[in-house]
Interface confidence: low
């Protein structure tokens, strides 16, 4: 009988988030490992032959950029191991035996947010990565908009924007004559309970997009008759 060597408790924790395309960003909290040690995470694919990807930690972060042929798919499944050298010997720890990227999604923010002012409303349009276009219907957006001089904490929000890459802000939602700013973020939509597990994505909101500035359109209200009209 052999007693296992306890390698814990481990005070480090790892968080790895994917943009659901070709990038996995990892962040860790750990005691200093000392000079000369270059720790890394190793992602070993359970799906693809040759699917081993090294993530060299610089400070508390590392990023894996997958080759184009390894674009992430819902069935992807990795084992993550943590490697570092101590006293000239490599130490290996198991981080996650079953890392499912689709359960740890943080998408890149929408890009190319633009405004188009028409009489009575403003049309906002934006772009997503071409790699995400097949899952357009799974993307949920949140819009924040405000007067330019206001802080983002005071912004109005519109959420549950699903499956589209444009929306209309009506003039009555804006303050006429003022310059406004809008920004957008995206996440994988929360699906109904009857969706099969293999198609279920979870994660967090992306960072906010670069804001777009626009002049609020004039309101097209009904003409108000002068006093005294019958």
């Amino acid at each position: 009988s052999v007693t296992g060597e306890g390698q814990g408790p481990r005070s480090r924790t790892f968080t790895c988030l994917t943009n659901n395309i070709l990038r996995i960003d990892c962040h860790w909290s750990a005691p200093e490992l000392g000079q000369g040690s270059s720790p890394w995470l190793l992602f070993t694919s359970n799906q693809a032959p040759g699917g081993t990807h090294k993530c060299i930690l610089r400070g508390s972060e590392c990023t894996v950029v997958l080759p184009p042929e390894a674009v992430l798919v819902p069935s992807d499944n990795f084992t993550i191991t943590f490697h570092h050298c101590m006293s000239g010997r490599e130490q290996v720890s198991l981080v996650d035996p079953e890392y499912l990227p689709r359960r740890h999604v943080k998408l890149d923010p929408p890009s190319d947010l633009q405004s188009n002012i028409s009489s009575g409303h403003c049309i906002l349009t934006w772009s997503i990565s071409p790699a995400l276009e097949p899952m357009t219907t799974l993307l949920s957006y949140e819009l924040a908009f405000k007067k330019q001089e206001e802080a983002w904490e005071q912004a109005q929000h519109r959420d549950h924007i699903v499956g589209v890459t444009w929306l209309i802000l009506e003039a009555f939602e804006l303050d006429p004559g003022f310059i406004h700013e809008a920004r957008l973020r995206v996440q994988m939509a929360t699906l109904e309970d009857d969706v099969v597990e293999e198609e279920r994505y979870t994660g967090q909101w992306s960072e906010w997009s670069q804001p777009v500035c626009f002049q609020a359109p004039q309101r097209q209200g009904p003409l108000i008759p002068p006093w005294g009209w019958p």
Partner: nanobody, 117 residues
Framework: QVQLQESGGGLVQAGGSLRLSCAAS????????MGWFRQAPGKQRELVAV???????NHADSVKGRFTISRDNAKNTVYLQMNSVKPEDTAVYYC???????????WGQGTQVTVSS
Amino acid sequence: QVQLQESGGGLVQAGGSLRLSCAASGSIFSINAMGWFRQAPGKQRELVAVISSGGSTNHADSVKGRFTISRDNAKNTVYLQMNSVKPEDTAVYYCLVATRGGTYEYWGQGTQVTVSS
């Protein structure tokens, strides 16, 4: 504390088979994953195969199609069936148990597997 009992290592001819076993006992109520790593002389310790509590398995590319990891949850035992072994499979094989959340992990002392050509 977790106790690990490894068995099954030894000398085998290239093309032959071996079955490694690792039984865990002790504070095993929170075991998340069990698996095998190996370390050949002068080389880094590497993942061979791992199996999660849910039964999902992961095998290193170098052993896919030849080695199979399995687990008997009732016995808290993990197995590594090694078929069509090659001289480059010669290494010390270590059993690994990791608890849920990755707070603790335990390693066996290792069992030697030698493949002769």
